[in-house]
Amino acid sequence: REEAKPYPLFPGPLPGSLQTDHTSLLSLPHTSGYQPALMFSPTQPGRPYTGNVAIPRVTSAGSKLLPPLAFKHTVGHIILSEHKDVKFNCSISVPNIYQDTTISWWKDGKELLGAHHAITQFYPDDEVTAIIASFSITSVQRSDNGSYICKMKINNEEIVSDPIYIEVQGLPHFTKQPESMNVTRNTAFNLTCQAVGPPEPVNIFWVQNSSRVNEQPEKSPSVLTVPGLTEMAVFSCEAHNDKGLTVSKGVQINIKAIPSPPTEVSIHNSTAHSILISWVPGFDGYSPFRNCSVQVKEVDPLSNGSVMIFNTSASPHMYQIKQLQALANYSIGVSCMNEIGWSAVSPWILASTTEGAPSVAPLNVTVFLNESRDNVDIRWMKPLTKRQAGELVGYRISHVWQSAGISKELLEEVGQNNSRAQISVQVHNATCTVRIAAVTKGGVGPFSDPVKIFIPAHGWVDHAPSSTPAPGNA
């Protein structure tokens, strides 16, 4: 049952190994003078740590009770530098009456399985077999820090060795590095740096723009309070321990400023009374945008030059300007703010609204039945439309016929040069209600007040017209 037997017989010391009286064997190159380390528990939380002695219930042929089984004492504490190799051992002498004995290695309460360099060697004698379990790690890393133990199962008893503390030492390792910040000019702020060994302690020096800030080191963790900056600076920290120095990343501390003005203000859509714009935000000045202001000036030389201001959120970078005059020219600029203040206004752009619909209805609408009784004659006066309504393109006539509970609305379109129209009688013995609206490219204006005329049955004629008075006429 010997897996490897490079040396003759245990318990004499193995060549090339260090044996500390009756402790476990240890092969440890280059370990002198190394300092302390981070170590973890050899037990699992909530799990009792089994003692390392098992009292066999079996007696030998001569019926004498066997001595308690126990691992020999271990070396205790191995200290070495990162990237070195280490080998350590557990040893136990087991009476030959025990057959199947297996030794497992555990680190910090977890069994070490898989690709670990563990070798168990058996050295049989007349009455006992000396078992040496060796564990080797090549190029140790910090993660190899911990408490290592051997466990042996024998006759349903578990025998546990004393722990071997492996302490891997190296350059300081950062657990918290300074972070980039955006700060207000001349306002104090803190930076934090934390590094660990082993070996401890770790001392921290702060560096600003390549120059050391503190003459005396501070123990890790260190908080640097900077009373305030007037310009951008780069900070880093140096962590020192007995093994040497590690430098953190350099972090830029920016000074918050007002934003740059927005650029590329664009028109996306214009209607008679609104304009949809977008813009590209400028540099935020190391402080998030809070909101933006859209400024609108009417370009008409006759206007009073007043500026309309519309406040909006900083995102999305788009705004629909409303309540504008139709067929007007505007100059539009955008400014945005952060916690420091407002940016300058973007370059101004020109934009125009489209024609609007007429705002007034045709005047003096009159309606009467012509002599042939086949037509209704409608007359009106052209409304006094404003320039912004655009060019008149025509009129829309609504006539509603009502008779015996039945109602029917018809619409007619006539050209802009007309101020009269004739419509065919649709129903006799009925009321016809007429309304007229002016039409431009901007849309349909308001309808005039309704004018009603009664269309009698055949054979009865009434030439009296119906009309709406012109404004100002009694």
Partner: antibody
Framework: QSVEESGGRLVTPGTPLTVTCTVS????????MGWVRQAPGKGLEYIGF?????NTYYASWAKGRFTISKTSTTVDLKITSPTTEDTATYFC?????????????WGPGTLVTVSL | DVVMTQTPASVEAAVGGTVTIKCQAS??????LAWYQQKPGQRPKLLIY???NLASGVPSRFAGSGSGTQFTLTISDLECADAATYYC????????????FGGGTEVVVK
Amino acid sequence: QSVEESGGRLVTPGTPLTVTCTVSGFSLSVYGMGWVRQAPGKGLEYIGFINNVGNTYYASWAKGRFTISKTSTTVDLKITSPTTEDTATYFCAKGGGGDWGYFNIWGPGTLVTVSL
Amino acid sequence: DVVMTQTPASVEAAVGGTVTIKCQASQSIGNALAWYQQKPGQRPKLLIYAASNLASGVPSRFAGSGSGTQFTLTISDLECADAATYYCQTYYAINRYGGAFGGGTEVVVK
């Protein structure tokens, strides 16, 4: 990295007392902590240890007389039923690792006086 | 628990001289031994751990040796500031054997 004890005071025999150790600059989930006491004019006496995962170990003489527990930043030592022999300065100390009971950082100590 | 026996209880030496303090464990503790220095009214300070490894910031005038059950602390080129009480402590398998201290050795510097 530092540790500091608090809660030491004058108590009468039999009155339970808890002494607290507050740590800063390191994590109790990585390092174990020990309690050591020193009677006036006497040597250091190991009481017990709590490792990084919360397992507690006591000197054989201290079992049943003391209870060690911890939170994320504090470690408590409870003297369950003090006697006059428990009059001492109580030190808490940071272990070298999770389960290592050598102590590389010590608190200044807190005085517990047990008297009628 | 392991019992630690420290000798002598007190030692006197002149400035520039050498002092040797011994510590014996009641059973093998490998190299899991630490040495501490304590001055009157102060907290203890770690000097050496793993029997021979100097703690950070400790002068090389302090040296530890030994393994198993016999350990030695040697202070050479003695200075007035070295006047203190020195303690050994085992931390071998602390979960099983405790973390006992030796009784202490008072060093008097003349």
